[in-house]
């Protein structure tokens, strides 16, 4: 009579993670009498999955009736499979004694476990940086199998193509890690501009996962200063304006000198937005000329976003204004951002 | 008592080929179940293949194709012939009388060292 054979059919076997797998083996002849043992791995390192004979094993059941005497299907159904289950799976069949004896196994069979990946999330640098400058981005996903993925990047639906991209670990693994750095030249219209970092996996049937950053946690637009000098309002009076145009974030603080004294400070609040996602905001003086006998230099100082102050300045010349008598006094404030100079 | 002896192990350079013999003492060998076992510097034992009573034969995934076990029941000596060997193979090499149930302690020989190598 031939020897008995165990036969496990599936070389490899294929499931989603939450899924049950259902491990194949048969047996060739019901002699030598002796149980079936599952095992994931062999030798030193392997680990129970099933015994025959005795023990608990509440994520396995046999897909026929094991304990029947003439059973030659020993084929098991392994429940809410994780990536954790991936391995080698051998079907053992041992020879009844004191102790059992192992007298055969199956060639194996390979669970591979396809496990979605992560939503992939996308950081930006600490620091704001300004136009012109190159940043990077990174972009991380974990818990995937098997270990193909395919990740691109996108500025405002534009490929990039200056990204590095590295899947670990190296060797096998139960589950996998993808981590992308890319570099992003900013322009001053980035404001309302997205970096999407976009992953595509075997089992996520065509339709990849995003994640995103905003450049507007990253840019910082500097403001153009322009200080101009109105016609005269009111006898003996200028109105001087300094636009600050262009910028981004809105946190501004702007202050007046008056030959270099500080004469009002205040913070951008009432700003206009453009189009491009950038602020303007315009602060003004109404000065008194006739409380001046020179000429007054006045100076538009802005300090946005924690950086070092920019400044513009003005001269305004008292010799062309006709000085009145007794007119030293101050001129009445008719707006929120005036300011008389005495 | 079990007494297990592997030999035939030495430097090779990559794609070349080794063959280790087991020759085993104290226990019925022919009925044995019996298997190769590997453990590199620093790393932890490793299942290499084993083969039955009767010839037939289960190999563990990295080594399919390029390894072979064989025995000689008439000189209680199982084989393992070792073909496009790699640098990974480098490792002490030891058997048991055991297959796939071998525990740490089945492999009690002294082993013997291949290393791959240009």
């Known amino acids: 009579e031939e020897e008995l054979q165990v036969i496990q059919p599936d070389k490899s076997v294929s499931v989603a993670a939450g899924e049950s797998a259902i491990l194949h083996c048969t047996v060739t002849s019901l002699i030598p009498v002796g149980p079936i043992q599952w095992f994931r791995g062999a030798g030193p390192a392997r680990e129970l999955i099933y015994n025959q004979k005795e023990g608990h094993f509440p994520r396995v059941t046999t897909v026929s009736e094991s304990t029947k005497r003439e059973n030659m299907d020993f084929s098991i159904s392994i429940s809410n499979i994780t990536p954790a289950d991936a391995g080698t799976y051998y079907c053992v069949k041992f020879r009844k004694g004191s102790p059992d004896t192992e007298f055969k196994s199956g060639a194996g069979t390979e669970l591979s476990v396809r496990a979605k990946p992560s939503a992939p999330v996308v950081s930006g640098p600490a620091a704001r940086a300004t136009p012109q400058h190159t940043v990077s981005f990174t972009c991380e996903s974990h818990g995937f199998s098997p270990r193909d993925i395919t990740l691109k990047w996108f500025k405002n639906g534009n490929e990039l193509s200056d990204f590095q991209t590295n899947v670990d670990p190296v060797g096998e693994s139960v589950s996998y890690s993808i981590h992308s750095t890319a570099k992003v030249v900013l322009t001053r219209e980035d404001v309302h501009s997205q970096v999407i970092c976009e992953v595509a996996h075997v089992t996520l049937q065509g339709d990849p996962l995003r994640g995103t950053a905003n450049l507007s946690e990253t840019i910082r637009v500097p403001p153009t200063l322009e200080v101009t000098q109105q016609p005269v309002r009111a006898e003996n009076q200028v109105n001087v304006t300094c636009q600050v145009r262009k910028f981004y974030p809105q946190r501004l603080q702007l202050t007046w000198l008056e030959n270099g004294n500080v004469s009002r400070t205040e913070t951008a609040s009432t700003v206009t937005e453009n189009k491009d996602g950038t602020y303007n905001w315009m602060s003004w003086l109404l000065v008194n000329v006739s409380a001046h006998r020179d000429d007054v230099k006045l100076t538009c100082q802005v300090e946005h976003d924690g950086q070092p102050a920019v400044s513009k300045s003005h001269d305004l010349k008292v010799s062309a204004h006709p000085k009145e008598q007794g007119s030293n006094t101050a001129a009445e404030n008719t707006g929120s951002n005036e300011r008389n100079i005495y | 008592h079990v007494q297990l002896v592997e030999s035939g192990g030495g430097l090779v350079q990559p794609g070349g080929s080794l063959r280790l013999s087991c020759a085993a003492r104290?226990?019925?060998?022919?009925?044995?179940?019996m298997s190769w076992a590997r453990q590199a510097p620093g790393k932890g034992l490793e299942w290499v293949g084993a083969?039955?009573?009767?010839?037939?034969?289960v190999y563990e995934k990295s080594v399919k194709g390029r390894f072979t076990i064989s025995r000689d029941n008439a000189k209680n000596t199982m084989y393992l012939q070792m073909h496009s060997l790699k640098p990974e193979d480098s490792a002490r090499y030891y058997c048991?009388?055991?297959?796939?149930?071998?525990?740490?302690?089945?492999?009690s020989g002294q082993g013997t060292l291949v290393t791959v190598s240009s």
């Open positions: 048991a009388p055991k297959g796939v149930v071998a525990d740490e302690g089945d492999y």
């Open positions: 104290g226990f019925s060998f022919r009925d044995s179940a």
């Open positions: 083969i039955y009573s009767d010839g037939s034969t």
